[in-house]
Interface confidence: low
């Protein structure tokens, strides 16, 4: 007698490993023999699909080599024309040993930055990811964390983070290890010991000493007055990531010597600089060289002192005038650390405006000297004691240099603002009138040696700061 199909063994959930065989059984009783069809996620599985084997009149579906994409709901449907079609469904869960799909790679990172070592995994059940540094499991802390993705994130990378890392992916079916990768921590070049300034007699031998560190170990180069050192012998030694460079010089002229430590990070370089002056006792200064050009000040040391957007004179007797003059100021400012709080701002203003003189924007750029009145104000009022010391040092040759900019200006030789208001530059930071003169404590018990003329107040219109110009 005809009998409608009945599925006697309903489909069950099947667990299968990748690349293994998975079989669904759909046992049917019926008469006549039914037609059995199979679907995956409601899409018909074609009889000629070579990834599957359908046997036992359709009752047995075998996936010959399971892939992770075979996950899904498999249904068999039996129909023989008697009664309705019947269906049974079961799930295929693809189980997978851990697999590292995006392994970590070697990383070079600069100290203080954030490093991320990738470790993306696959697997079912989802693998847990841990990391090994060297031979020991890596412990997480406030800086070091294993992300949800499995990647290792290290904030504020330190030198001690450098080393060999590998990630480990683990689930109930097995364990996968990445290859070992190297985290290299690079450190910007830094000068540990700066060269010291010297005042020596003509024909002396002087050794300038500069020590620097960094990862990779920096190279040290020496610059003389803005150009590569042309004479002198250099001895170098490297120990424990510290480079020690000694420049021995036979002194026949004064100079500004700069030690430059450089190391490379990929395509970029980091540099650290320190400068020392060599001055010669009884050295007669050459005539002031007015060869140069005008530009906006772009340095740092005199930022707060120089008038905003003022054009300053840059002396092309240096290969890199901005840098050389900036180093001159930097070196001189270090000398000012010991002066009184009243003197210091005045001396800084004088120094910055003397080294970065205001520019006369003519066809041939020339520097505008500081007005005599402002120079005298610093000398006789703000810095009386300190000036005596500076003049003493000047007489002993400590400030004497081929680079005239290092010397203290001689106030008496500067033009007065009463002669030609445009022929000299004011120091806006020192503008004062009779009233606020009283606010400054006396520098010395003795009376100033010259009468300091009234300087205009900042509100005075008769002596406004000369305009700035743009060069075309």
């Amino acid at each position: 007698l005809p009998k409608a199909p009945v599925i006697t063994t309903p489909l069950e959930t099947v667990d299968a490993l990748v690349e293994e065989v998975a079989t669904f059984m759909c046992a049917v009783e019926s008469y006549p023999q039914p037609e059995i069809s199979w679907t995956r996620n409601k899409i018909l599985i074609k009889l000629f699909d070579t990834r599957y084997s359908i046997r036992e009149n359709g009752q047995l579906l075998t996936i010959l080599s399971v892939e992770d994409s075979d996950d899904g709901i498999y249904c068999c449907t039996a129909n023989n024309g008697v009664g309705g079609a019947v269906e049974s469904c079961g799930a295929l869960q693809v189980k997978m040993k851990p697999k590292i799909t995006r392994p970590p790679i070697n990383v070079k990172i600069i100290e203080g930055l954030k490093a991320v070592l990738p470790c993306t995994t696959m697997g079912n059940p989802k693998p847990s990811v841990s990391w090994i540094k060297g031979d020991s499991p890596l412990r997480e802390n406030s800086r070091i964390a294993v992300l949800e993705s499995g990647s290792l994130r290290i904030h504020n990378v330190q030198k001690e983070d450098a080393g060999q890392y590998r990630c480990v992916a683990k689930n109930s079916l097995g364990t996968a290890y990445s290859k070992v990768v190297k985290l290299e921590v690079e450190v910007f070049a830094r000068i540990l010991r700066a060269p010291e300034s010297h005042n020596v007699t003509f024909g002396s031998f002087v050794t300038l000493h500069c020590t620097a560190t960094g990862i990779p170990v920096p190279t040290i180069t020496w610059i003389e007055n803005g150009n590569a050192v042309s004479s002198g012998s250099i001895q170098e030694s490297v120990k424990d990531r510290v480079i020690d460079s000694r420049l021995q010089l036979f002194i026949t002229k004064p100079g500004l010597y700069t030690c430059i430590a450089t190391n490379k990070h990929g395509e970029k370089f980091s540099t650290a600089k320190a400068a020392a002056t060599i001055s010669i006792a009884e050295w007669s200064k050459p005539q002031k060289d007015n060869k140069g050009y005008c530009a906006q000040y772009r340095g740092e040391v005199c930022n707060a002192v120089l008038a905003k957007d003022a054009l300053v004179f840059l002396n092309t007797s240096y290969a890199d005038p901005e840098e050389a003059q900036e180093l001159l100021v930097h070196t001189a400012w270090n000398e000012l650390k010991v002066v009184s709080p009243v003197c210091r701002p005045a001396a800084e203003a004088l120094l910055c405006n003397h080294i970065f003189q205001e520019c006369s924007p003519g066809v041939v750029p020339t520097p505008i000297p500081i007005c005599r009145e402002y120079c005298l104000a610093v000398k006789e009022l703000f810095c009386a004691k300190e000036w005596l010391v500076m003049e003493e040092k000047t007489h002993r040759g400590l400030y004497r240099s081929e680079m005239h900019l290092l010397s203290v200006p001689e106030c008496s030789k500067l033009p007065s603002m009463h002669w030609d208001p445009t022929a000299c530059a004011r120091l806006p930071h020192l503008d004062y009138n009779k009233e606020n003169l009283k606010t400054f404590p006396p520098m010395t018990s003795s009376k100033p040696s010259v009468d300091i003329p009234n300087l205009p107040s900042s509100s005075s219109s008769s002596f406004s700061v000369s305009p700035t110009y743009s060069m075309t």
């Epitope: 803005g226 150009n227 590569a228 050009y293 092309t316 290969a319 743009s470 060069m471 075309t472």
Partner: antibody
């Protein structure tokens, strides 16, 4: 990525003025830290710098060509132009426009493909 | 005017080191640039500021500059390095100067 492209006549008669235009895309000609130069290369010879216009419009010219050279710009079109007067057959060359960048010590980091100019009657 | 002198040609065996020099009065006090030019193409910057390599330029290109000579060094020259090489500096009057060019032949 900035791109520069020269355009202009390929043939100029002697004694006339040669005018070429360089169109800049992917960056402004008024951007600080960049300057815009004209450089030429006669057939079989080396490179010769002709002049430059800075971001602020100031111009500088090669001493040997100064009397005949003028560089101007049209900021609305992001173009700069070369005018070379009183040309002779010696001015036959491939003319390049190029960007100079302070970030690379004023080296020319972007060049046009060059335009061939022949001076002939 | 400022003159930059380059030798017209230099030959180097494949994978050997080539040195191309550029002479100029006190060139060491200036930034030297180097450009590579292949036939029918525009020049390409290979070094700037004496020894800095732009991204995309192989590590075999290096440079130095002191005294009166700037040098471009190609360590382990490849066939594709065969080209003309030009040095370039700016002077203090905002004039740019090119050397006459050196043709590098890779044997």
């Amino acid at each position: 990525q900035v791109q520069v492209q020269e355009s202009g006549p390929g043939l100029v008669k002697p004694s006339q003025t040669l005018s070429l235009t360089c169109t800049v895309s992917g960056g402004s000609i008024t951007a600080r830290y960049y300057s815009w130069s004209w450089i030429r290369q006669p057939p079989g010879k080396g490179l010769e710098w002709m002049g430059v216009i800075a971001y602020d419009g100031s111009t500088y010219y090669s001493p040997s060509l100064k009397s005949r050279t003028s560089i101007s710009r049209d900021t609305s079109k992001n173009q700069f132009s070369l005018h070379l007067s009183s040309v002779t057959p010696d001015d036959t060359a491939v003319y390049y426009c190029a960007r100079g960048s302070s970030r690379v010590a004023a080296a020319f980091d972007s060049w046009g493909q060059g335009t061939q100019v022949t001076v002939s009657s | 005017s400022y003159e930059l002198t380059q030798s017209p040609s230099v030959s180097v065996a494949l994978r050997q080191t080539a040195k191309i020099t550029c002479g100029g009065d006190n060139i060491g006090s200036k930034n030297a640039q180097w450009y590579q030019q292949k036939p029918g193409q525009a020049p390409v910057m290979v070094l700037y500021a004496d020894s800095r390599r732009p991204s995309g330029i192989p590590e075999r290109f290096s440079g130095s500059n002191s005294g009166n000579t700037a040098t471009l060094t190609i360590s382990g020259a490849q066939a594709e390095d065969e080209a003309d090489y030009y040095c370039h500096v700016w002077d203090s009057s905002t004039n740019a100067w090119f050397g006459g060019g050196t043709h590098l032949t890779v044997l």
